[in-house]
Interface confidence: medium
């Protein structure tokens, strides 16, 4: 599998409509929780929780602050932590508790605390519960949590130093935790947790399971340096711990290695960055998408692998276990365990079969089973990805977060659209197209190129958004910028399953937002632009330039995958010739203008899609070079002239192949501004041309003129 290509289109922050939320002096907007039924996005930041309108996040609806007392700050600083940054309250857990409350935990100046947030009054109830084991002490430490039926399952560190990892369930009747032992958790970096509900019609009366994803230091591979391993672990919701062995500890904790590698090249991605569980009506079993980087990532590599949950279940239900053996010098080595496995199967959830054998709860499990799972939490079998290879491998980028949306194209094909954020504040949107990856677009979400810390996807029909949290704020972006594709070709070549061309309105429309039936819409995921109707009207722009000057002709081709070339009077121009130059890879510069340069210039783009090359006329310019006598300006009016040589531009509509919409007149050079008089300058004798000066270039004005000095080059 080859590396993914560059994104086809790059949208700068200012180019697209992005809604932003940030509050002065509030940072680290890293906890996001969406309430779809209330159209509310809850945002946990440093020392604050906000509720904003999910359809327009700039509209703040509620706010509550949870600050650290000066006394607590001082105590924290005494322990060597920074009073300005670390000794504050970073909200790390933001989970739904009931219809009217949230469960919120914060680092609280290295004394983690939890509270209930009443959504009616938007006030904390002041419970001030100990957050140990639910929330990290250190804002820099990893954490993950999920609320399951009113009980918080979390993965974090249990002490001030962050040296004791824990996966726990906070429950009034049955709190459970992992053993503090290297075979269970070895310096883990927690990434994600979620509950997978057993289907109601499941025949074996199985339990809901809670899955944890993390990267930890390997126990099974021994090298000179510490090898990191990505893991999937799971516990059973019904687990109540053991009666004597594993009392108040998980009896169902099992973990396995996640494989994400490129077999042909030996590329192994072993650091897990994020996980997204894709649930869709069309999916019998959820699919989880995992984002990885290699351990030694000096080239900026990232990969996405997708896994069927049933593959993981199979490993836990029927896979072989690993066992530690002591070799010379009390050195521990982990190998496959081939001996007898006690019954009931160690680590299994209590199902109908266990209940039939009178094991109605984990408290009834025999010591043999419990001792075995205590000593053998690691599976020998690994969880392998769908198709045994990554969905995407990208070079020169560090991906940080992933969300995935399953959508149906116009032809009925289902696509998993991956939205992946980067450590430079961008969002990539990618799909798999016939075993190749197509990165539809890259959107610069954050102007300051800061890492995206959290990504969230709304699943409500109609208004669909991606929400991204960073240190400075939250950004809301639509799933597609269909309207930005100005022509049918652009719309089709985007190969965006959310977008289709609507011939009646001559616009690229978002499929999920069109109420009307999709009849007549054009979408071709193969990128075959020949399906587009013939253009009846295109536009060309007429320019008048002065003899001896320089002209710059614009060509706004957004595609990064297209090659741009220019034609003059139907002959292809060589940009290398001293007469011509390319500016910004696309705009044509013509030097030392003479009458022979008058004529029609066409900017064409050539884009390779599959085995076809698609040609498009992107812009058409009609250039006329004239010898124009210098206008006489009345002494009372000053016209500040700038370098350049264009004296007029007209936009005309004509029958051409190009179909770009007319754009405002462009400057011949970018070398400064023109100061224009308040009224048209009075001209001298009658033999000189009358020059009309408009301060704002109008698209269809008969004359939009600029006064320029002659070019002395």
């Amino acid at each position: 599998m080859a590396f993914a290509p560059i994104p086809r289109i790059t949208w700068e922050h200012r180019e697209v409509h992005l809604v932003q939320f940030h509050e002065p002096d509030i940072y680290n907007y890293s906890a996001l929780l969406l309430s779809e039924d209330k159209d509310t996005l809850y945002i946990g930041a440093r020392e604050a929780v906000f509720a904003v309108n999910a359809l327009n996040i700039s509209e703040k609806q509620h706010e509550v602050y949870w600050k650290v007392s000066e006394d607590k700050k001082a105590k924290c600083a005494e322990k060597g932590k920074s009073k300005q940054t670390e000794c504050l309250n970073y909200i790390r857990v933001l989970q739904p508790l009931s219809a009217t409350s949230l469960y919120v935990c914060g680092t609280n100046a290295f004394q983690p605390a939890c509270d209930h947030l009443n959504l009616t009054s938007f006030k904390f109830l002041g419970k001030n519960e100990d957050g140990k084991g639910r929330c990290p002490f250190d804002p820099a430490h990893s954490y993950t949590s999920v609320m399951v039926d009113g009980e918080l399952y979390s993965g974090t560190s249990y002490n001030f130093l962050g040296s004791e990892p824990i996966i726990s369930r906070n429950s009034s009747h049955s709190p459970l935790r992992t053993e503090y032992a290297i075979p269970w958790l070895n310096e883990p970096s927690f990434v994600f947790a979620d509950v997978i509900r057993k289907s109601p019609d499941s025949p074996d009366g199985e339990d809901d399971r809670v899955y944890f994803f993390f990267t930890e230091v390997s126990v099974e591979y021994e090298f000179v340096f510490r090898v990191l391993i990505p893991r999937i672990a799971r516990v059973c919701k019904g687990d109540q711990g053991g009666l004597r062995t594993l009392q108040k500890k998980w009896t169902s904790f099992l973990k396995a290695r996640l494989i994400c590698s490129r077999p042909d090249s030996g590329l192994v991605f072993n650091v897990l960055r994020d996980v997204f569980v894709l649930r869709s009506p069309g999916l019998k079993v959820p699919v989880f998408y995992a984002l990885f980087t290699p351990q030694l990532n000096n080239v900026g590599l990232s990969a996405v692998c997708a896994y069927n949950l049933s593959t993981a279940e199979e490993v836990f239900s029927h896979g072989k276990y690993m066992q530690s053996t002591t070799v010379e010098q009390s050195h521990t080595k982990w190998v496959r365990y081939n001996g007898p496995v006690p019954k009931p199967r160690p680590g299994a959830c209590i199902d109908s079969e266990a209940r039939a054998a009178n094991y109605t709860s984990s408290l009834n499990l025999p010591d043999k089973t419990l001792q075995f799972v205590k000593d053998h939490p690691l599976m020998d079998d690994s969880v392998t990805p769908i198709d045994n290879r990554p969905r995407l491998i990208k070079k020169d980028v560090n991906y940080t977060q992933i969300v995935v949306d399953r959508t149906q194209a116009l032809d009925g094909t289902v696509y998993d659209v991956m939205f992946v954020s980067t450590d430079r504040g961008a969002l990539h949107k990618a799909i798999s197209l016939e075993h190749a990856v197509h990165i539809i677009e890259e959107t610069q979400l954050f102007q300051d190129f800061e890492p995206v810390q959290t990504l969230l996807l709304s699943s409500k029909k109609g208004n669909r958004f991606v929400y991204a949290g960073s240190n400075s704020g939250v950004v809301q972006a639509p799933l597609a910028f269909c309207g930005k594709h100005g022509t049918c070709e652009d719309c089709v070549l985007a190969r965006d399953p959310y977008c289709a061309w609507s011939p009646p309105t001559a616009t690229c429309v978002a499929l999920h937002q069109t109420e009307s039936p999709s009849r007549g819409l054009i979408q071709e995921m193969s990128g075959d632009a020949s399906v587009c109707p013939d253009k009846s009207k295109g536009s060309y722009r007429q320019h008048f330039f002065k003899h001896g000057g320089t002209a710059e002709l614009k060509c706004s081709q957004k595609s990064n995958l297209a090659r741009v070339f220019w034609k003059f009077q139907n002959g292809v121009l060589k940009a290398e010739s001293p007469k011509y130059g390319l500016m910004g890879r696309k705009n044509l510069l013509i030097f030392n203008l003479s009458e022979g340069d008058s004529g029609v210039y066409q900017c064409l783009s050539e884009e390779r899609v599959k085995n076809k090359t698609v040609f498009q006329v992107v812009a058409k310019h009609v250039l006329e070079v004239k010898v124009v006598p210098k206008p006489v300006v009345a002494p009372t009016l000053s016209v500040v002239q700038t370098e350049g040589s264009r004296i007029a531009t007209k936009v005309l509509v004509a029958s051409t192949q190009g179909s770009s919409p007319p754009t405002p007149a462009v400057q011949a050079t970018s070398s400064g501004a023109i100061t224009l008089p308040p009224k048209p300058a009075p001209t001298g004798t009658s033999c000189e041309p009358k020059i009309v000066i408009n301060t704002v270039p109008q698209l269809h004005s008969e004359k939009t003129m600029y006064l320029k000095s002659s070019d002395n080059r």
Partner: antibody, heavy 118, light 110 residues
Framework: QVQLQQPGAELVRPGSSVKLSCKAS????????MHWVRQRPIPGLEWIGN????????HYNQKFEDKATLTVDKSSNTAYMLLSSLTSEDSAVYYC???????????WGTGTTVTVSS | EFVLTQSPTTLAASPGEKITITCSAS???????LHWYQQKPGFSPKLLIY???NLASGVPARFSGSGSGTSYSLTIGTMEAEDVATYYC???????????FGGGTKLEIK
């Protein structure tokens, strides 16, 4: 059953003050914002302000900032609104109402008709 | 200043008729924050619909609400004599905290 009981009417002199009460029964005040709303034929219903009975945090409509003062007595489960410097313009029906969530009032008081007259 | 404009201000209808009252916001709001009340003569207002389309408890199913952005509406599927009242739309809390009511629509019987 949740109810908010208010006295039926108050007759007061211009320039004086009046303290309106709103007693909750069937639920405690804490955990819900308690609001006060004024109703006159024109302009209709107007929001005056709200109070959180648990810690007495208040918010006022700017228009009523110098007119109304909201308080609460948790022990008697009663919310109060003090209206000061009364003029004939303040003659209206005043309702207390409980907020049920995203700014909607699910329980309304019976209303007190205030008449300012010399 | 944020304003909710209701139309019509008065409406006379016969029992069995379908009634629609509209509420227009001066700027876009979340559907989560738009609510409707019914006030019968001599009584306190009563919550009818909350969050644009959710019926308050005890409200007959002939009442429904819809809308988004700046345009919202209350519909009575088939009017009954007991529906004679004034109907108000209201925008709920947002920051800064300000709760705004529409001017009201008086529904009378023909």
């Amino acid at each position: 059953q949740v109810q908010l009981q208010q006295p039926g009417a108050e007759l007061v002199r211009p320039g004086s003050s009046v303290k309106l009460s709103c007693k909750a029964s069937g639920h405690t005040l804490t955990g819900f914002w308690m609001h006060w709303v004024r109703q006159r034929p024109i302009p209709g219903l107007e929001w005056i302000g709200n109070i959180d009975p648990s810690d007495s945090e208040t918010h006022y409509n700017q228009k009523f900032e110098d007119k109304a003062t909201l308080t609460v007595d948790k022990s008697s489960n009663t919310a109060y609104m003090l209206l000061s410097s009364l003029t004939s313009e303040d003659s209206a029906v005043y309702y207390c109402a409980r907020e049920g969530g995203t700014g909607y009032f699910d329980v309304w008081g019976t209303g007190t008709t205030v008449t300012v007259s010399s | 200043e944020f304003v909710l404009t209701q139309s019509p201000t008065t409406l006379a209808a016969s029992p069995g008729e379908k009634i629609t009252i509209t509420c227009s916001a001066s700027s876009s709001i979340s559907s989560n924050y738009l609510h409707w009340y019914q006030q019968k003569p001599g009584f306190s207002p009563k919550l009818l619909i909350y969050r644009t389309s959710n019926l308050a408890s005890g409200v007959p199913a002939r009442f429904s609400g819809s809308g988004s952005g700046t345009s919202y509406s209350l519909t009575i599927g088939t009017m009954e004599a007991e529906d004679v009242a004034t109907y108000y739309c209201q925008k709920g809390s947002s920051i800064p905290r300000m709760y705004t009511f529409g001017g009201g629509t008086k529904l009378e019987i023909k």
